[in-house]
Amino acid sequence: KIDACKRGDVTVKPSHVILLGSTVNITCSLKPRQGCFHYSRRNKLILYKFDRRINFHHGHSLNSQVTGLPLGTTLFVCKLACINSDEIQICGAEIFVGVAPEQPQNLSCIQKGEQGTVACTWERGRDTHLYTEYTLQLSGPKNLTWQKQCKDIYCDYLDFGINLTPESPESNFTAKVTAVNSLGSSSSLPSTFTFLDIVRPLPPWDIRIKFQKASVSRCTLYWRDEGLVLLNRLRYRPSNSRLWNMVNVTKAKGRHDLLDLKPFTEYEFQISSKLHLYKGSWSDWSESLRAQTPEEEPTGMLDVWYMKRHIDYSRQQISLFWKNLSVSEARGKILHYQVTLQELTGGKAMTQNITGHTSWTTVIPRTGNWAVAVSAANSKGSSLPTRINIMNLCEAGLLAPRQVSANSEGMDNILVTWQPPRKDPSAVQEYVVEWRELHPGGDTQVPLNWLRSRPYNVSALISENIKSYICYEIRVYALSGDQGGCSSILGNSKHKAPLSGPHINAITEEKGSILISWNSIPVQEQMGCLLHYRIYWKERDSNSQPQLCEIPYRVSQNSHPINSLQPRVTYVLWMTALTAAGESSHGNEREFCLQGKAN
């Protein structure tokens, strides 16, 4: 009831706490001399459900039967209305609608660790919408009982605060939870268990790993456990992997040898414990131990390629390139690469350690037969050397692959295709596809890329270090014993019209014709592989269409003659460049007047 109802009363029958669906009778009655002044028979009593008028009656009391109340609390307020005055509150009452508690389900108890305390959880069932008290009871041997009450509104967990000990691990304990509210009570089914059933060990701690003689093949994992632990399970994985390796061990006594770890790999290790083969539950996983395994000597062999460049009649430049070993092959941090260069007939050999690079350039005589061997070294040893004989890779014309083509294949990929060489195709031992950014100066510092292809393949998709709008010089080599043949082509993964035309830097007169010289378009403005240059000219101040001359693009060419100009006529000349996507804008304009005699 609303406290201190001086003017009257509101009573609720049968109770102010009712079961959902029940009917209640509400009575509002005025106390003596609390009605309307002089007009007691004109008293108008009004019953409100919260702010909604549900009934009224003239007189000293009002009765109302109410049904269909929702779950929860509903407030009823009784007011008095007198003529010529505001309604005044007389009294009020709340009605609490709920349900009796359902039987608690799935009662289960656990003790975390041998020194922990017993705690139980259960499922309450549907909300009662009333204050519901839960009592948890535990009975054990020798008529021992413990009881704990929960005053929390949504109670589904209680800790007894008692510790079960392993003195008699097979002794039975029985737990039961009872829910009580104003409308009834209900008890769970009893849950019976032993010490071994409910003790969940603490996760192992103090995890360490040792590698005997710094070897990955002699690795032991150590940890500490509670005293009664019988079983462990270990899980471990490389730190960059999502999949765990799992090992179950019995009576490990805090140590286990691991035999299948990879060298030079960071691993994550976790351990879990259990007290009994088929009773009880596994502990939580321990905190992770992260540790890196020791190095082992590299396996595998380096993929080595080379380039020869003529310097003069007696010398040649050899540039060697190699690819990093994969992580699984390197098996450690590669400290250096060892390159050995040997003249096969004279036996002269020179060895050099290369750090921080995957290439090496040297100058050697053009005479003699030369071979190189390259290996990778870490702290534990070296990989097997890759040996190659230096030869003229393009010398055997009959080994040259035929009909080489290069086509864009999606974003930043180029599909290179070819036909086998005319010479017996079965002689080909492998193809090598090589590509590098095209630089008009033939810059040897431009990174070289290559891939190897089996002798029965006639295509290769190149995607490594391929950028859009860049032209690549692509070579396909066919290798057979100590011979090689090659074919080349230009290709790009994406192209558009060049951003600018060539810049004419000079026009000179030679015997009645002119020689036009130009600067190459900067690589970043070429926007792919150039196919042609165009030279345009027309008479100055003329509105006629310009004449043009189209020149196939060649990397090193930067001049071209024109012999169709009339003497003593001033011409305006300019140039454009074309890719497969279109023509550039004009380059600079130059005026020129041929001085020679007319024909």
Epitope: I2, G72, L75, F96, Y131, D152
Partner: nanobody
């Protein structure tokens, strides 16, 4: 045991606003209504507004359109935003949590509206 503490009362001119709040201790309040009542000098305590556990709100005629009740179950707090205050709103404002085992009341906060 539930304890309630109101705050936010004070002296305000007619037409002004105040925001009352009432903070509870004890998690059981989340399943119950939370109410505001007021008591003017010489009068009995009367109901002003209620908010149910699921957030439905109700107002006495004198408060409708001017007052807004709200609750934050995480903070176990109920609020009463009072706008367009009139001198007749002067009273001590109490918050209340009704339960089937009895009502819990706060100590009240004084609101005075001067003309």
């Amino acid at each position: 045991q539930v304890q309630l503490q109101e705050s936010g009362g004070g002296l305000v001119q007619a037409g002004g606003s105040l925001n009352l709040s009432c903070t509870a201790s004890g998690s059981i309040i989340s399943i119950y209504n939370m109410d505001w009542y007021r008591q003017a000098p010489g009068n009995q305590r009367e109901w002003v507004a209620s908010i149910t556990s699921n957030g439905d709100s109700y107002y006495d005629g004198s408060a409708k359109g001017r007052f807004t009740i709200s609750r934050d179950n995480a903070k176990m707090t109920v609020y009463l935003q009072m706008n367009s205050l009139k001198p007749e709103d002067t009273a001590v404002y109490y918050c209340k949590v009704p339960t089937e085992n009895g009502n819990y009341w706060g100590q009240g906060t004084q609101v005075t509206v001067s003309s």
